[in-house]
Amino acid sequence: LYFSRDAYWEKLYVDQPAGTPLLYVHALRDAPEEVPSFRLGQHLYGTYRTRLHENNWICIQEDTGLLYLNRSLDRSSWEKLSGRNRGFPLLTVYLKVFLSPTSLREGECQWPGCARVYFSFFNTSFPACTSLKPRELCFPETRPSFRIRENRPPGTFHQFRLLPVQFLCPNISVAYRLLEGEGLPFRCAPDSLEVSTRWALDREQREKYELVAVCTVHAGAREEVVMVPFPVTVYDEDDSAPTFPAGVDTASAVVEFKRKEDTVVATLRVFDADVVPASGELVRRYTSTLLPGDTWTQQTFRVEHWPNETSVQANGSFVRATVHDYRLVLNRNLSISENRTMQLAVLVNDSDFQGPGAGVLLLHFNVSVLPVSLHLPSSYSLSVSRRARRFAQIGKVCVENCQAFSGINVQYELHSSGANCSTLGVVTSAEDTSGILFVNDTKALRRPKCAELHYMVVATNHQTSRQAQAQLLVTVEGLYVAEEAGCPLSCAVSKRRPECEECGGLGSPTGRCEWRQGDGKGITRNFSTCSPSTKTCPDGHCDVVETQDINICPQDCLRGSIVGGHEPGEPRGIKAGYGTCNCFPEEEKCFCEPEDIQDPLCDELCREQKLISEEDLGGEQKLISEEDLHHHHHH
C-alpha cells in the first residue's frame, strides 16, 4: 500500500464544530488483495517539526481515510499550542498519517507509508459562506500533485470536495470534472467526486499527466468556473530488461599511443527504459563483471559503469530512461613493448529486474595492443642568438607521434661533442612527450669558438631501455651585448612598454623582453604585460621550463598573491587580468591595474591606502596597503 500524495492541506478555524469532516487521505494498492487501514500519529507538530501537543482534536476513520474534528479547537487550546511553538507565530500545524501495517513507531514520516496533513490555522471563526470566493469553495490553497506507481491495480486516489465547505455551506452547489481525462486512464465519478485510475499505468508509455480540474460553483443564480492544474506523476519500477541500442553488443579497439592508466579503450552502451534503481543504489544493483580471462587481462583492464538519464519519445510524449555506458579502461600504464590481441566479455546484470525474460546481457570487447617504436628525424638544425638569456626556449625535439602519446615515458638527453660549448639543456614536456630545448649556460654562448654547437639528442624509454638518436646542429648568431645589471631578472616586473623593451630577462630568446598589448576588455585573458617571449608567456600554462625559475614567467607560474582585478589561474598564475599585470617574483606578488593610471595619482593613493573596488576592476574587493605598493608604484 502507498499514499497517492506525500502531503495534504486543509484550513482550520477556531471553534469549528466537533464532527466537521476535514479531508480524505487515499491509499493505493500494490497488490489486488491489499486493504488499507489508516492510523494517525499521536502528536501535532508546529514550526521546525516542533512537537506541540498530543493530538486530542482530530480523528481518522481507519477504513475510509476520513479525517474529522473529534472536538472543537477553542481559543484556549490554540493558545496552549502556540505557547509551545518556540516563540514563532503558529500559522500551520501538521499531523502524520500512517498506513498500517507499516511501522507502528512514530518516527520519520516518509512516503510511501506515511503522509503529512498540514492545517493552516486561522485565529477566527469559519467565514460566512457568502463571503467565500469561488476559489476558496473549490480547491485547497496548495495545489495537490499525485504519485501513482506503474503496473499497480487501479484505485481511487483523490476526492475533490472541500469537506468543511460542504458541511458548513450545504446550500452552495459545487461540481467537478477533469479536462483532458477522456481517453486517459483517469475517471472522476460525478456522484462521489472521487478520482480513480481506470487501469494500471505504464510509466514507459507516459510519465506525467498534466490534467486540469474544473470546478463549477452554483450559488443562487450565479455560476462561476475555477480551473487548476491537476498533475499526476507515474512512479517507476524495474519492469524493463536492459537492451543493446541498435543491437550493438561488440566493440573493437586498438591500444597504441594512448597507454596511460585510466585511458578509456572502448565503450559499449546499454539502454534501459527504466529510471530505477535510483542513482544512490544504481551501481550496487546494476552490476558489471569482467568475466575471468588470463591474469594479464584481469590486471590490465577494468570496466567502469557510467549511467546517465536520457529522454525517449513514447506515444507523443517524452519519458525518462537510462543509458548505461560500460567503459573498458586501462588499469595500469602499458609498456611500449606490449603486443597482444584479446577478447574480453563483461556480464551486465539488472539485479532488480523481475522478468519476464532475463535482466542479463553479455558485452564483448575485442582489443589489440600494438607495440610502439621510438623514432627521431635523422637530424635537427636550429639557431640561437648570442644574446639569449638563460631558460630561453629555442626549439623542440619529438619522437615520431609524441604528440599523441600518453602513458609513455620518454626522457630526452643532450650529449655535447664540445665540452666547453655545452650551452643547451633539454626537459621533457609532460603535455606532449616532446623535449623542450632551452639555454642553460649563457657563458658558453659568448665564447667566440662556440659558433656551432653539435649535440646528439637521445630519446629513451627507461622501462624498456629502447632508444632513438638524432644529430642536433645549433648555429649561434649575432653579437653579444652585455646585459645591464640594473635590469630586472624577470621581464614581468616592467609595467610599461618602453622599460619592458629596453631590458632583457630570464627566458628571453632575443635578449630583449617583449611587450604584449592587451585588448583592454575588462578582466581578460589578453591583459597587457611584459614577457620574455609572447609565444610561451603568458599562455595560461606554467610549462616545464617556466617551472624551473619563478622569474621566467610569474604571470603563468606565481603561487603568491595577485592584487587588483583578476581571475586566478588553476592551479597558479593569472588566468585573466584587468589592464596591465606586472609581477615581483621575489615578493611573490603580482598587480593588475588600469593601464592609464598616472604616477602622481598612484603616489597620492599610496600615501593612504589604495582600494581597488569591484566597480573599478570588476573583481573581488582588494585592499592594497602601502607595503604592497612599495617598489611597485615607482617602478
Epitope: A482, E484, L489
Partner: antibody, heavy 119, light 107 residues
Framework: QVQLVESGGGVVQPGRSLRLSCEAS????????MHWVRQAPGKGLDWVST????????YYSDSVKGRFTISRDNSKNTLYLQMNSLRAEDTAVYYC????????????WGQGTLVTVSS | DIQMTQSPSTLSASVGDRVTITCRAS??????LTWYQQKPGKAPKVLIY???TLERGVPSRFSGSGSGTEFTLTISSLQPEDFATYYC?????????FGQGTKLEIK
C-alpha cells in the same frame, strides 16, 4: 624585518685564507641576489663580488678575481666569501648587501665585519 | 669599468641650506644609479634608487635627478642629522662601481 649579519672577520697574515659568512633573516633568502662590498679604513666603498639568487652566476672585481670565491647555501640562508692569498690591501670592513631581482640596487646592508691583513 | 666621479669631495653647509651633490659616469648608465648616505662606523643607507626614486622611509627633502651620465642628489633643507658622507653607485654593469664620496660637513 630584514637583517644581514656578517661574521668571520679578524686579523690574518698575508698569503693566508679567511672565510666570511653573512646570515640572512626576515626575507626569503633564496629569491635574492647577494653582494660583498668592502671599505678600507677612511676610504670609499669598493664592490667585491656578486652571486645570483640561485647561485647560477658569479661576478668578481678585477682586484680579487682568482683569489676570492663567493658562494651561498640557500637552505641555511647564508652567504659566504672565501678569501685566499690575502694581501695587505684587502684590509677593510666587509659588508654583505641584498639585491632584489626586480630592482637590482643594493637595498639592505649588514653592519660589516673587519678583516685586517697584517704580518 | 665605468668610472664614477663625484663632486665636490667635501661640502660645508648650514642647517636649512639647499645642497646639491653631482655624480658623473664615464659612459651612459641610463638610470641605474643609487645614492647612499653613510655615517661613521655604520653601513651605507639607501636614499635614492633608479636615479630619482625615493627609498621607502627616506624624508622627502632628499631628491635625485638625471640620466645617462649626469646625476644630482639634492637636499632641499639640511637637517642636523644629514651631515654624513654621500656615495653614488652605478649598477648598469656587473663591474659595479662607486663614486669616491662627498663629505657633507657643518659650516
Amino acid at each position: 624585518q630584514v637583517q644581514l649579519v656578517e661574521s668571520g672577520g679578524g686579523v690574518v697574515q698575508p698569503g693566508r685564507s679567511l672565510r666570511l659568512s653573512c646570515e640572512a633573516s626576515g626575507f626569503t633568502f633564496r629569491n635574492y641576489g647577494m653582494h660583498w662590498v668592502r671599505q678600507a679604513p677612511g676610504k670609499g666603498l669598493d664592490w667585491v663580488s656578486t652571486i645570483y639568487y640561485d647561485g647560477s652566476d658569479e661576478y668578481y672585481s678585477d682586484s680579487v678575481k682568482g683569489r676570492f670565491t663567493i658562494s651561498r647555501d640557500n637552505s641555511k640562508n647564508t652567504l659566504y666569501l672565501q678569501m685566499n692569498s690575502l694581501r695587505a690591501e684587502d684590509t677593510a670592513v666587509y659588508y654583505c648587501a641584498r639585491d632584489p631581482p626586480s630592482f637590482r640596487y643594493f637595498d639592505y646592508w649588514g653592519q660589516g665585519t673587519l678583516v685586517t691583513v697584517s704580518s | 669599468d665605468i668610472q664614477m666621479t663625484q663632486s665636490p669631495s667635501t661640502l660645508s653647509a648650514s642647517v636649512g641650506d639647499r645642497v646639491t651633490i653631482t655624480c658623473r659616469a664615464s659612459q651612459s648608465i641610463r638610470s641605474w644609479l643609487t645614492w647612499y648616505q653613510q655615517k661613521p662606523g655604520k653601513a651605507p643607507k639607501v636614499l635614492i634608487y633608479k636615479a630619482s626614486t625615493l627609498e621607502r622611509g627616506v624624508p622627502s627633502r632628499f631628491s635625485g635627478s638625471g640620466s645617462g651620465t649626469e646625476f644630482t642628489l639634492t637636499i632641499s633643507s639640511l637637517q642636523p642629522e644629514d651631515f654624513a658622507t654621500y656615495y653614488c653607485h652605478q649598477y648598469s654593469s656587473y663591474s659595479y662601481t662607486f663614486g669616491q664620496g662627498t663629505k657633507l660637513e657643518i659650516k
